[in-house]
Interface confidence: low
């Protein structure tokens, strides 16, 4: 007859931190040296035995004299309520065919975690619990006095729970968030009426979820050490030593070696000299709550990250070439390096690739003279490209060369009695053509009528003009720029003995915001080009004199520059250049890039005042120095009369008042007789010029009273 195999010696211990019950028992009457498959049913009750909250089965193989263990984790902190546990068993083994029957239940084992001792009337659990963000947590309070009203708050916000018995209320916190690394504050307050009886709080330590390490990668620079790096993601460390920062361990499966990493985002792995080429690394991140791991498999020779090249030098540097040399750290015999050179200079970047063994050399050609360059080099494994090394660079400057272009030269010729005054201008050579620092300009003046006669003027840089007084002969003038190496080609200009073409009429032109669009009739005969020069009409010519060269087949150009200002008049002259380099004035033009309304009104005089008329005149008003071409004048007249005088028409002023207006369309007509007036009458007038942009500024009217018929003025 089979004896019932009843669980005996049931002991229950607790782990408050883990909120777990640990059951320990043995099975009596088991056959010696036999193993049986058994099922144990476990019942757990809370507060009282009849309140069963959990039932479950645990299957295992049981030996004689074996102590069995099983654990259960409670959602509710164990301090919140008494728990009761009992167990029964069933043989579920083929050695014992049916009928199988359950044993009797063991007696209830009471589990009470007494942490509500002392004089306090209120307790909150669990204390200092560590959980992961997003988990569900149950907390409770235990109140000694059931007459007390207890309110609980999570980070200051009231929470509501479920009463388990008159002394205990539980609160389910769903998907708890991470708030701060020093924990989430929860407190409860007991009160009777409006009187506080006491307050208790706990800190719930919510850890951020441990992330899988990202961007895990290993590389070597010397075949001695592998340098592994990763992005650890969020640090899961919590305050008060509740949870340290996650730890990282490297495991290499081929060698079976393991290393605890002492840094949060990198670890060095010693490469043993046993010619292991393939590595299979697992990086394990671990904190108190979970583990995460990532894997990489690679061939060592495919993960070479070289140290940056060194000893970068430049040899045989001249104006247009240089030899760049460098060294690389030798890491293995017969290793081929792929190196990339970057050359930066004059706002440009060139890139070159070269394969080398030990020392690098590259011939840099087609360089600009007198230019500072920055050259840098980086290298990688040519056989299995993984990653470029860091750059190593150095600056060098090419030597100067003779200037490569003639200066751009122009002139202003003014006729004085018996001679020409020639003001010669030149533009500084661009860096591209100067090929170094321009030190001086040589101006050679040669009298074409007396070929043996010539003069040399040496003008130190940075001067860009000079004045020559020449007699009424023809002259050839050469301008040459010089630097420390040599001279530029000469720029040649010829000054004719004949005076400039005086008969050229000046034409008015209208500019735009973009500048001035100019066109002209081609010069008869052969021309080698045209020159357009210009300056501010009102200023000294030398102040802002500019010119532009135009090709021989072009008879129009647009002069656009930021220097053109609204309300400023510019004078343009267009010259043709003959094959003999003699300039002939073809056309003159004048205009504004943008006309403005007149800046002032004329000073008006009242003449010949009679009982029936008066004369207005403003002879002194200059039309030249205005911010636009004066097109004429508006004469405004006010009187008591309802009707406007002949030639005047009704107008409304900006203030809304009515008056009479007369328009003069000739800017040089600077007088007006106002007649048909009544004696002893009161009149007011105001005169303003106008341009295409509008009238001059508004001003006060001037008052005039006509005398009686018998008076004489």
């Amino acid at each position: 007859e089979r004896l019932p195999l009843t669980p005996v010696s049931l002991k229950v211990s607790t782990n408050s931190t883990r909120q777990s019950l640990h059951l320990q028992w043995t099975v009596h009457n088991l056959p010696y040296h036999q193993e049986l498959k058994m099922v144990f049913q476990i019942q757990i009750s809370r507060i009282e035995t009849s309140n069963v909250i959990w039932v479950g089965n645990y299957s295992t193989t049981v030996k004689w004299n074996q102590v069995l263990h099983w654990s259960w984790e409670s959602e509710l902190p164990l301090e919140c309520a008494t728990h009761f546990v009992r167990i029964k068993s069933l043989v579920d083994d083929a050695k014992f065919p049916e009928p199988n029957f359950w044993s009797n239940w063991s007696s209830w084992e009471e589990v009470s975690v007494q942490d509500s001792t002392g004089q306090d009337i209120l307790f909150v659990f669990p204390k200092d619990k560590l959980v992961e963000e997003g988990t569900n947590v149950t907390i409770c309070y235990v109140s000694r006095n059931i007459q007390n009203n207890v309110s609980c708050y999570l980070e200051g916000k009231q929470i509501h729970g479920e009463q388990l018995d008159p002394h205990v209320t539980a609160f389910n916190l769903n998907s708890v968030p991470f708030i701060r690394n020093k924990g989430t504050n929860i407190y409860c307050e007991a009160s009777q009426g409006n009187v506080s009886e006491g307050m208790k709080g706990i800190v719930l330590f919510v850890s951020k979820v441990l992330e899988e390490p990202k961007d895990f990668s290993c590389e070597t620079e010397d075949f001695k050490t592998l340098h592994c790096t990763w992005d650890p993601g969020t640090d899961t460390a919590l305050g008060w030593s509740k949870q340290p920062s996650q730890s990282y361990t490297l495991f290499e499966s081929f060698s079976g070696e393991k290393k605890l990493c002492t840094h949060k985002n990198w670890c060095n792995w010693q490469i043993t000299q046993d010619s292991q080429e393939t590595y299979n690394f697992t990086l394990i991140a671990e904190n108190y709550l979970r583990k995460r791991s990532v894997n990489i498999l690679f061939n060592l020779t495919h993960r070479v990250y070289l140290m940056n090249p060194f000893s970068v030098n430049f040899e045989n540097v001249n104006a247009t070439n240089a030899i760049m040399t460098w060294k690389v750290h030798s890491i293995r015999n017969n290793f081929t390096y792929l190196c990339q050179i970057e050359l930066h200079g004059e706002g440009k970047m060139m890139q070159y690739n070269v394969s080398i063994k030990v020392n690098g050399e590259y011939f840099l050609s087609e360089l600009e003279p007198a230019t500072e360059y920055m050259a840098r080099v980086r290298c990688a494994d040519a056989s299995h490209f993984w990653k470029w090394s860091e750059w190593s660079g150095q600056n060098f400057t090419t030597l100067e060369a003779a200037p490569s272009e003639a200066p751009d030269v122009w002139r202003i010729v003014s006729l004085e009695p018996g001679n020409h005054t020639v003001t010669l201008f030149w533009k500084p050579l661009s860096k591209l053509h100067a090929n170094g620092k321009i030190l001086f300009y040589n101006v050679v003046v040669e009298n074409l009528d007396k070929p043996s006669s010539s003069e040399l003027h040496s003008i130190p840089a940075p001067a860009n003009s000079t004045k020559l007084i020449l007699d009424r002969c023809s002259y050839q003038i050469c301008v040459i720029a010089n630097n420390s190496v040599g001279a530029s080609p000469a720029s040649v200009i010829v000054i004719s003995a004949d005076p400039e073409n005086k008969e050229v009429e000046e034409e008015r032109i209208a500019g735009t915001e973009g500048g001035f669009s100019l066109s002209w009739k081609p010069q008869p005969g052969d021309v080698i080009g045209y020159v357009v020069d210009w300056c501010d009409h009102t200023q000294d010519v030398l102040g802002d004199f500019q010119w532009k060269n135009v090709g021989p087949n072009t008879t129009s150009t647009v002069i656009s520059t930021d220097a053109f200002r609204p309300g400023v008049r510019y004078d343009f002259r267009i010259y043709g250049l003959s094959t003999k380099r003699i300039a002939c004035l073809l056309e003159k033009k004048t205009g504004y890039s943008q006309e403005l309304a007149p800046s002032d009104n004329p000073h008006v005089l009242v003449d010949t005042l009679t009982s029936h008329s008066f004369t207005l005149s403003w002879k002194d008003y200059s039309t030249e120095s205005q911010p636009g071409f004066i097109q004429g004048y508006h004469v405004y007249l006010k009187s008591k009369a309802r009707q406007c005088h002949p030639r005047f028409e009704k107008a409304v002023l900006s203030d809304g008042s009515e008056c009479c207006k007369y328009k003069i369309d000739n800017p040089e007509e600077k007088a007006l007789i106002v007649d048909n007036l009544k004696p002893e009458s009161f009149y007011e007038f105001f005169i303003t010029p106008f341009t295409s942009a509008g009238e001059g500024p508004s001003a006060t009217f001037t008052k005039v009273t006509t005398p009686d018929e018998h008076s004489s003025m």
Epitope: A237, G239, S241, P244, S245, T262, H263
Partner: antibody, heavy 120, light 107 residues
């Protein structure tokens, strides 16, 4: 080179306070945990307190808990130990030590120590 | 707290000897165990960390082994400069604890 220099030690009466400082140089201070370890005359080593690289984890020996406070200022490369309610048994040579990692692993660099004497 | 017990407390040996010092933890500390050497009037020096990893610059005659609760420090061939006091230390849990020390003297 890597160096730790302690200061702030001296003679103090029981119940009074003292603040120790440790100036670090030659390494990236905020990449490592730091410790205070003491040695009473003729005795062995006793760990006093430790602080992780970002101050997220702090630990104390039971004998000093509630009286001593460890802190660090990464911007100043400095470690501190505020000692309150000093007792005669706190008399010792106090070492500042650098950990090999960001948490508590092992102490690879030590200062020369500063002496604290608690006596009436 | 994890109690660390070193044995022997003191030890006499000669230059060239092989010496072993043991350290026992009151509970498992995994491999979170370090060994230090201290000479009179000097600060301690880290010899071995993680039970068996030799600290950079430490001679290879020093070695460590063990895991869990039992650990050993071995000096394969004593040199004159090795006579000092040796401490084990666990960093498995706080508070960190040291052994009471083993004094190694010249015989």
């Amino acid at each position: 080179q890597v160096q730790l220099v302690e200061s702030g030690g001296g003679l103090v009466q029981p119940g009074r306070s003292l603040r120790l400082s440790c100036a670090a140089s030659g390494f990236t201070f905020d990449d490592y945990a730091m410790h205070w370890v003491r040695q009473a005359p003729g005795k062995g080593l006793e760990w006093v307190s430790g602080i992780s690289w970002n101050s997220g984890s702090i630990g104390y020996a039971d004998s000093v808990k509630g009286r001593f406070t460890i802190s660090r200022d990464n911007a100043k490369n400095s470690l501190y130990l505020q000692m309150n309610s000093l007792r005669a048994e706190d008399t010792a040579l106090y070492y500042c030590a650098k950990d090999i990692g960001v948490y508590y692993y092992g102490m690879d660099v030590w200062g020369q120590g500063t002496t604290v004497t608690v006596s009436s | 707290d994890v109690q660390m017990t070193q044995s022997p407390s003191s030890l006499s040996a000669s230059v060239g000897d092989r010496v072993t010092i043991t350290c026992r933890a009151g509970q498992s500390v995994g491999t979170y165990l370090n060994w230090y050497q201290q000479k009179p009037g000097k600060a301690p020096k880290l010899l071995i960390y993680a039970a068996s990893t030799l600290q950079s610059g430490v001679p290879s005659r020093f070695s460590g082994s063990g895991s869990g609760t039992d650990f050993t420090l071995t000096i394969s061939s004593l040199q004159p400069e090795d006579f000092a006091t040796y401490y084990c230390q666990q960093s498995y849990s706080t508070p960190i604890t040291f052994g009471q020390g083993t004094r190694l003297e010249i015989k």
